[in-house]
Amino acid sequence: SSSPTSSASSFSSSAPFLASAVSAQPPLPDQCPALCECSEAARTVKCVNRNLTEVPTDLPAYVRNLFLTGNQLAVLPAGAFARRPPLAELAALNLSGSRLDEVRAGAFEHLPSLRQLDLSHNPLADLSPFAFSGSNASVSAPSPLVELILNHIVPPEDERQNRSFEGMVVAALLAGRALQGLRRLELASNHFLYLPRDVLAQLPSLRHLDLSNNSLVSLTYVSFRNLTHLESLHLEDNALKVLHNGTLAELQGLPHIRVFLDNNPWVCDCHMADMVTWLKETEVVQGKDRLTCAYPEKMRNRVLLELNSADLDCDPILPPSLQTS
């Protein structure tokens, strides 16, 4: 069989394409990539709203804060930031709004100091399970990431191909247990219908979790027990109907927690009694006096804190013989 023509003679089979990414000429100390603005004093490079189609190859080695927002990157290949010498100081990377729809395995490898990563407002239809871990090993080297911002990364409906977007994101968060040190995770505005039950247990260092503006209906199978460091939990603007006893007890048991529950369609029936009792006693819910009923109709806009057990009834279920058609 004929072999393809190639731009290199022979590479290792595991990463045959990294050579071109890494072998770019080392940038001059004060060089700034075309279409970017650089400040060596601030250790900052901004390549913003320039329709870049790839990550510049000649980023200065001093860069600590890199803004690549508002571009047309589309794809982040393996080793997208691999350089010789490596970008050893890069700590904050913002790629928001750059029309990324494919982030591949190992995209953020060779960034030993990367603590903050923002991929928000990109239609991530193809997020590799190994995007953050860089390897398909069952246990990867720990990622230095402390803050991961993934707000509004849900692709258009026609690009989701009948698969679980939640599952794809969670697979990337959990792969190789690389993100054990993650302290802030933002997943707002992603149309999440559910939270896979194992995700929080494997992110034990979380301080801040933002799940606002999703479509979460229930937290019944989600455990917060391990998140002993959690300080803020944003659940505003979801589809939550009620929080059950198990969830209430777990939240109450977290020593530093503040919970945000505004703008959920609370169903004020007999199942709400425990939550109302809890709300009246707890200090963990911020703005609890703003929480109001959405259903049933007769309870709409009633303030949860003002309800008593007599208000919270369930219509009796009639036996079949008494039901009318």
Epitope: S7, T53, A74, V75, P77, A78, A125, D126
Partner: antibody, heavy 117, light 108 residues
Amino acid sequence: EVQLVESGGGLVKPGGSLKLSCAASGFTFSDYGMHWVRQAPEKGLEWVGYISSGTYVVYYADTVKGRFTISRDNAKNTLFLQMTSLRSEDTAIYYCSTYGSNPFDYWGQGTTLTVSS
Amino acid sequence: QLVLTQSPAIMSASPGEKVTITCSATSSVSSMHWFQQKPVTSPKLWIYSTSNLASGVPTRFSGSGSGTSYSLTISRMEAEDAATYYCQQRSGYPPIFTFGSGTKLEIK
């Protein structure tokens, strides 16, 4: 060593269909995006379409949209191009190409499609 | 839609001569890739991201440019450089990958 081998070309009548394959080896196929590119006789290179590493993103050139479908089987290290409603202007050598660190890093040797009555 | 126009379409150069091929884009692009294709063979990635030589490419080749104007230069033409060269870039979203019209370089 990276190898890409296309197959499935041949002579097809206008309006007919054909499926091309590209067998990949020498690299972790499932980690990289793949393109199809074609070259009509004595003409330049024309991009046909792209499929992402995990198969969930596919782009097509306007000239083939709705007629061609790109797919891949990561378990078998194989890329496919299903072509329907073929026209004489689809006559070309069809190449598969990797999108590794850069678009079109490696190319196969090509397979020839002739559309003629 | 982005159109990449190469000039000249055909040119010939003597051994040792300096050669420059240009690629003009209808709208500003952030970088350019170049490919070399010899008769009856597949194209090869030759220069990526405007100025980076692909592995194995002789150092007599260089690339430069910005905005709408890019070029590939051979400092001293050699017989093995005779080939057709294509520029390439991507535009829009969803992306469209566009190749230039090609420049056929012959040896005198």
